[in-house]
Amino acid sequence: DAHKSEVAHRFKDLGEEHFKDLVLVAFSQYLQQCPFEEHLKLVNEVTEFAKTCVADETAENCDKSLHTLFGDKLCTVATLRETYGDMADCCAKQEPERNECFLQHKDDKPDLPPLVRPEVDVMCTAFQEHEDTFLKKYLYEVARRHPYFYAPELLFFAQKYKAAFTECCQAADKGACLLPKLDELRDQGKASSAKQRLKCASLQKFGERAFKAWSVARVSQRFPKADFTEVTKVVTDLTKVHTECCHGDLLECADDRAELAKYMCENQDSLSSKLKECCEKPLLEKSHCLAHVENDEMPADLHALTDDYVESKDVCKNYAEAKDVFMGMFLYEYSRRHPDYSAMLLLRLAKAYEATLEKCCATADPHGCYAKVFDEFQPLVEDPQNLVKHNCELFEQFGEYKFQNELLVRYTKKVPQVSTPTLVEVSRNLGKVGTKCCKQPEAKRMPCVEDYLSVVLNQLCVLHEKTPVSDRVTKCCTESLVNRRPCFSALEVDETYLPKAFNAETFTFHADMCTLSEKEQQVKKQTALAELVKHKPKATNEQLKTVMEDFAAFVEKCCKADDKEACFAEEGPKLVAASETALA
């Protein structure tokens, strides 16, 4: 349905509050360095303009596209050239090239100071005195640090953030109430950001077909009672929503997400028996709930997959007539029967099946050629099963911190050219897979482990893309989305790497180490471990374990000393010398 004014249409659909919040998120994700006040000014100007268009859709400029309106507004920022350098050149372009240019300048790791959490009383005062500004600051700070955060979901997080302050600022012990809630929101927010980053990467780097295939697998697992027609509808709408959000079209994205939620709730009977509770909630909670809904029970009477995809005489005919539909159906049928498989494994199976049909349907005896195709799936299935078994055993043996260290050593040896902060961050996140997934029942372990690893490895890929240093990382990241994890798993020690020269500064520690939180201390130790491996890539795990134990003892000893700084200055070089000997 055509609207005279797109901005008026979205303002009316979303309402003023959501409209303003989404425009703030959009601007903050594009101009990540701009001060909060500058963004608020831009948002207010856009909102006032939108209101004039609601009053009269034929008013001047109201017929312009949202990209044109928002881009023009962003290009009025006076310090664009000084703050953003060549991003200012985007403003010389016309739409749609201008928006594409802005998108290309989004920075996954912006140079911003880490967020410091003020005292609880300070936060509560700020919340109570200026609630609206306080919440908008939250949106701004998260959006600028996570330029691909799923915007309608960020509004949901802001709602949870508000609820936490509303409840806890009236509690007897504000801190005990608030801090755990903020920690949980922070962790959930980081996870949500990383998951969305993978969706955007899959759309932008591998195209709509790749995203749709992934969505067919996930939606079919969630809604095994839905027919393929219904799954196709949900997947098509979902793809539109994520394409819009990943493309910076946040108003359209939020509006279409609300429409999809409405459709799903109106069609629960043909989708899933698990949607009822979600559909009783208000909009933001409803959409969040639907996105995280548990898998429905599998229908009891599903016939054998081999009937249609191996035994049928029409396999090649059906495949040739409509390849995408036939493959979509295969993926749907396989996925709804296998909630115990990861989405990535299901996509690999579909890829293997398609490759077999391509080969066999061109032969004189197609059926004889593809008769054993399902047997070829066995090694593909066993690979992630072994990955889960092996890594969960390690996690149970070591615990999270030592498991992270094990992974850090493993990945530093695979790709030693990658920067130490990136290796530490990625390995820490990879290690969290144990805590998140290994306690799950057997049937949920593989989807949890492998799909989580895909999210984390995508973080490595996007960080590496910003400053590429390793051909091996580039290869694993770009060749195949579904084979990224197996590609990284298969990497052996990089024998071509020349050990990094020893730098005493890297292994010099001070008394400030003692005042760090446990997490910060771990990061410091893990940074030293990665540097150690880069210096001595041939070191065995046993040798590294010994050095790390010595290091932990050294920190503990000096942090108990009366003159901490003197202890670090004196004992540090001794530790380095002993480590050099141990690793010789």
Epitope: D227, F228, T229, T232, K233, V234, S270
Partner: nanobody, 118 residues
Framework: EVQLLESGGGLVQPGGSLRLSCTAS????????MGWVRQAPGKGLEWVSW????????YYADSVKGRFTISRDNSKNTLYLQMNSLRAEDTAVYYC???????????WGQGTLVTVSS
């Protein structure tokens, strides 16, 4: 090539019954959602009813609920629409349609005319 052939239309009095049939060929019938769409004189297309591939779930427009029954026989590649208690407003061309995505259809037949008149 996909073909859908409707039959069973005709002239019937208000309150009467008709059974429409649709024979399908050129695709794997049991894989697809099938339905009936109608177009009354001077009006747009309207979904009347649809049925899932395995026949376990059916949808009916509010205007026909309780009067029309959709069914399918996958072994015969045939779709049916049993229409009871027919009304003058049911007069339309009825098309058998193959659906690839909920709310849309990619193929439909030539149609069969149903006229309800005294």
């Amino acid at each position: 090539e996909v073909q859908l052939l409707e039959s069973g239309g005709g002239l019937v009095q208000p309150g009467g019954s008709l059974r429409l049939s649709c024979t399908a060929s050129g695709f794997t019938f049991r894989h697809y959602r099938m339905g009936w769409v109608r177009q009354a004189p001077g009006k747009g297309l309207e979904w009347v009813s649809w049925i899932r591939p395995d026949g376990t779930f059916t949808y009916y427009a509010d205007s026909v609920k309780g009067r029309f029954t959709i069914s399918r026989d996958n072994s015969k590649n045939t779709l049916y629409l049993q229409m009871n208690s027919l009304r003058a407003e049911d007069t339309a061309v009825y098309y058998c349609a193959k659906s690839y995505m909920a709310g849309t259809f990619d193929y439909w037949g030539q149609g069969t005319l149903v006229t309800v008149s005294s």
